[in-house]
Amino acid sequence: EINGSANYEMFIFHNGGVQILCKYPDIVQQFKMQLLKGGQILCDLTKTKGSGNKVSIKSLKFCHSQLSNNSVSFFLYNLDRSHANYYFCNLSIFDPPPFKVTLTGGYLHIYESQLCCQLK
Amino acid sequence: EINGSANYEMFIFHNGGVQILCKYPDIVQQFKMQLLKGGQILCDLTKTKGSGNKVSIKSLKFCHSQLSNNSVSFFLYNLDRSHANYYFCNLSIFDPPPFKVTLTGGYLHIYESQLCCQLK
């Protein structure tokens, strides 16, 4: 299922960086969240549980990230104009079944005021 | 799995329209192919087989399309500048297992010469 554009504020700017917010339903227990820039994987985070309900959090493409019970935030720093692009949150839901993939995204506009090192 | 940019010519222009080529491995027997514009589903085509090996081709979001044994082509007509965007082929493989999702894509640049109705 492709949800299309995020229906929430996906990009939060602070201190020359951006927090990209990838939401998921709080019923979801096990999942993989990938941040795509265009079609390339930039970051990922996978949450699974073992047979004894112990949680494992893994990253193959590591970015500074923050996990809550209904979102994963990925942080990009030292913004420059090359960061302007389409970004997508690619969510693979493992649990509860059935397996499902959703893609939500938006365009990250970079304005002068958001750049990390503006020329005065 | 995200394959990122298509490693083949994804966009073929003709007569003010574009053929968007979505390839899949010829070993794949049953699948769903979605054409995404940004994160929105623009077109889809699903090929499945029933118990008597009868093939079923279904579309929920119908576009003019063409199926071969290793690709689905989606056709967009009456191109204008608003068609310029990231386009992704989102392939869900059902058979052979295991279930797998791949996303490949690229940016569709629209140049004067490709528009359907140029002002002379």
Epitope: T48, K49, G50, S51 | -
Partner: antibody
Framework: EVQLVESGGGLVKPGGSLTLSCAAS????????MDWVRQGPGKGLEWVGN????????YYAPFVKGRFTISRDNAKKTLYLQMNSVKSEDTATYYC??????????WGQGTLVTVSS | DIVMTQSPSSLAVSPGDKVTINCKSS??????????LAWYQQKTGQAPKLLIF???TRHTGVPDRFMGSGSGTDFSLTINSFQTEDLGDYYC?????????FGPGTKLEIK
């Protein structure tokens, strides 16, 4: 098709050691937690322990008490159970299982370990 | 550790019978909307096979005569019309906490 094939079972003396292997195919091995479950002759199923996807974390049943070690080699798609200081009560068929997110959805055929002098 | 009990320990049945196996846990297995309980079938000389997960969801390919029900601490597996190929041992198992434990099993035999 998911396949799990155990090997390495056999006769071992009390206090001895043995390593069981489980070769996996038909799925992305590195995406799944894997477990060992055993079954004594004529008895029920007993969980031995598990290992997370990249092998960094393991958990064990209380009866193991440091005697067994579970490991994995994702490049070889293989799960291991190293058994040390074995006792007669460790005699059982040992099954390699895939934890399919919410149940043991795939099992090997089992390998028999007999502890006897 | 959570203790799982099953009843009966064995049952003699005939083809076409409705069969019910009960499983009880020493504490609730309910988390959110889900009960962390699975059922397995083991035929003689074979490895166990998954039948039911989350207490009531049938695994892929499992015939619809198998039904799981229950919540909290009390669960049951029902075979609506027993077939001879259903002979074997049936185990419930929780995955609410570590260690995950199995019930002692219920053996189905032909009457």
């Amino acid at each position: 098709e998911v396949q799990l094939v155990e090997s390495g079972g056999g006769l071992v003396k009390p206090g001895g050691s043995l390593t069981l292997s489980c070769a996996a195919s038909g799925f992305t091995f590195s995406d799944y937690w894997m477990d060992w479950v055993r079954q004594g002759p004529g008895k029920g199923l007993e969980w031995v322990g598990n290992i997370d996807e990249d092998g960094s974390t393991t958990y064990y049943a209380p009866f193991v008490k440091g005697r067994f070690t579970i490991s994995r080699d994702n490049a070889k798609k293989t799960l291991y159970l190293q058994m040390n200081s074995v006792k007669s009560e460790d005699t059982a068929t040992y099954y390699c299982t895939r934890w399919g997110r919410y149940a043991f959805d795939s099992w090997g055929q089992g390998t028999l370990v007999t502890v006897s002098s | 550790d959570i203790v799982m009990t099953q009843s009966p320990s064995s049952l003699a049945v005939s083809p076409g019978d409705k069969v019910t196996i009960n499983c009880k846990s020493s504490q609730s297995l309910l988390s959110g909307n889900y009960n962390y309980l699975a059922w397995y079938q083991q035929k003689t000389g074979q490895a166990p096979k998954l039948l039911i997960f989350y207490a009531s969801t049938r695994h892929t390919g499992v015939p619809d005569r198998f039904m799981g029900s229950g919540s909290g601490t009390d669960f049951s597996l029902t075979i609506n019309s027993f077939q001879t190929e259903d002979l074997g041992d049936y185990y419930c198992q929780h995955h609410y906490s570590t260690p995950p434990t199995f019930g002692p099993g219920t053996k189905l035999e032909i009457k």
